[in-house]
């Protein structure tokens, strides 16, 4: 039975040209995390494999940095970066846990971080 929950940074906003950290945290399970995938809609941004370490998708290498931890840092943000981001935790023996973050990239300097929330 899958007992874990993923806590994410929730709905967040950031300024155009700036950076943002996407964070997820898996809790309430003893399952072993074998890999974490970060995805933006239909594209794989990066993976962190327990055996092989971090690997950034070639098409995002100039704007994506690994960490902190199992999180992901997006740099040089554009309005086109607005949208849904997913952290997918591949675990053994539980299976897959998915967290969702919505990022809005704003033109102005009024960007503020949203509250953290949990996805069961």
């Amino acid at each position: 039975m899958m007992t874990g929950t993923i806590e994410t940074t929730g709905n967040i906003s950031a300024e155009k040209g700036g950076s943002i950290i996407l964070q997820c945290h898996l809790s309430s399970t003893t399952a072993q995390v074998t890999q974490v995938n970060w995805e933006q809609q239909d594209q794989l941004l990066a993976i962190c494999n327990a055996d092989l370490g971090w690997h950034i998708s070639p098409s995002f290498k100039d704007r994506v940095a690994p960490g902190p931890g199992l999180g992901l840092t997006l740099q040089s943000l554009t309005v086109n970066d607005t949208g849904e981001y997913f952290c997918i935790y591949h675990t053994y023996p539980d299976g897959t846990y998915t967290g969702r973050i919505f990022l809005e990239v704003l033109e102005s300097s009024v960007a503020e971080h949203g509250a953290r929330f949990q996805i069961p």
Partner: antibody, heavy 117, light 107 residues
């Protein structure tokens, strides 16, 4: 230029072991993964496993755990695959390839292994 | 393990024709798919990565599309030198499984 030079063809007896080498040149050895792929005669490509030469971390397809052991020597920029308890099912061409996780961009020329008594 | 299924083991085509090879993943793999060309007696060659990105030096007659579970590799105008076996491979999660391969035969 990037090159992966594999060791030569091997003819070995059933029950023995063999160690195939893959010498890398033309790039920073520890910055890329080394992947290993098997091709049986008339069959398709089968992924065996991968090693991160920088950390020594490895990942294997389940069926090759206990069969293949991947190692890397940073000082000589050489990756190795040892195959143990050989049977006729292990007769194949084995390729090493440089991996960026998302693709394998340079491949060795292949090493033919024949297991026969 | 993620299973990659190439429904056609063989495809027959003529020089100048457009041909498409399909690959279906048993579960979601985002755009984590690469395509390789393997000619007899040679090492495999990377053509497409991340489903749709053409690798350096690969002719633009080779294209890839798809995301999620369904992927297509297309040669817009087949040349005689394209005689080969074409493999898809998923890089979404280990083990990095290959499809069974599609052998392109020139009529």
């Amino acid at each position: 230029q990037v090159q992966l030079q594999q060791s030569g063809a091997e003819l070995v007896r059933p029950g023995t072991s063999v160690k195939v080498s893959c010498k890398a040149s033309g790039y920073a050895f520890t910055n890329y993964l080394i992947e290993w792929v098997k091709q049986r005669p008339g069959q398709g490509l089968e992924w065996i496993g991968v090693i991160n030469p920088g950390s020594g971390g490895t990942n294997y397809k389940e069926k090759f755990k206990g069969k293949a052991t991947l190692t890397a020597d940073k000082s000589s920029s050489t990756a190795y695959m040892q195959l143990s308890s050989l049977t006729s099912e292990d007769s194949a061409v084995y390729f090493c390839a440089r991996g960026e996780y998302f693709f394998f961009d340079y491949w060795g020329q292949g090493t033919t292994l024949t297991v026969s008594s | 393990d993620i299973v990659m299924t190439q429904s056609h083991k063989f495809m027959s085509t003529s020089v100048g024709d457009r041909v498409s090879i399909t690959c279906k993943a048993s579960q979601h793999v985002s755009n984590g798919v690469a395509w390789y060309q393997h000619k007899p007696g040679q090492s495999p060659k990377l053509l497409i990565y991340s489903a749709s990105y053409r690798y350096t030096g690969v002719p633009d007659r080779f294209t890839g599309t798809g995301s999620g579970t369904d992927f297509t590799f297309t040669i817009s105008s087949v040349q005689a030198e394209d005689l080969a076996v074409y493999y898809c491979q998923q890089h979404y999660n280990t083990p990095h499984t290959f499809g069974g391969g599609t052998k392109l035969e020139i009529k």
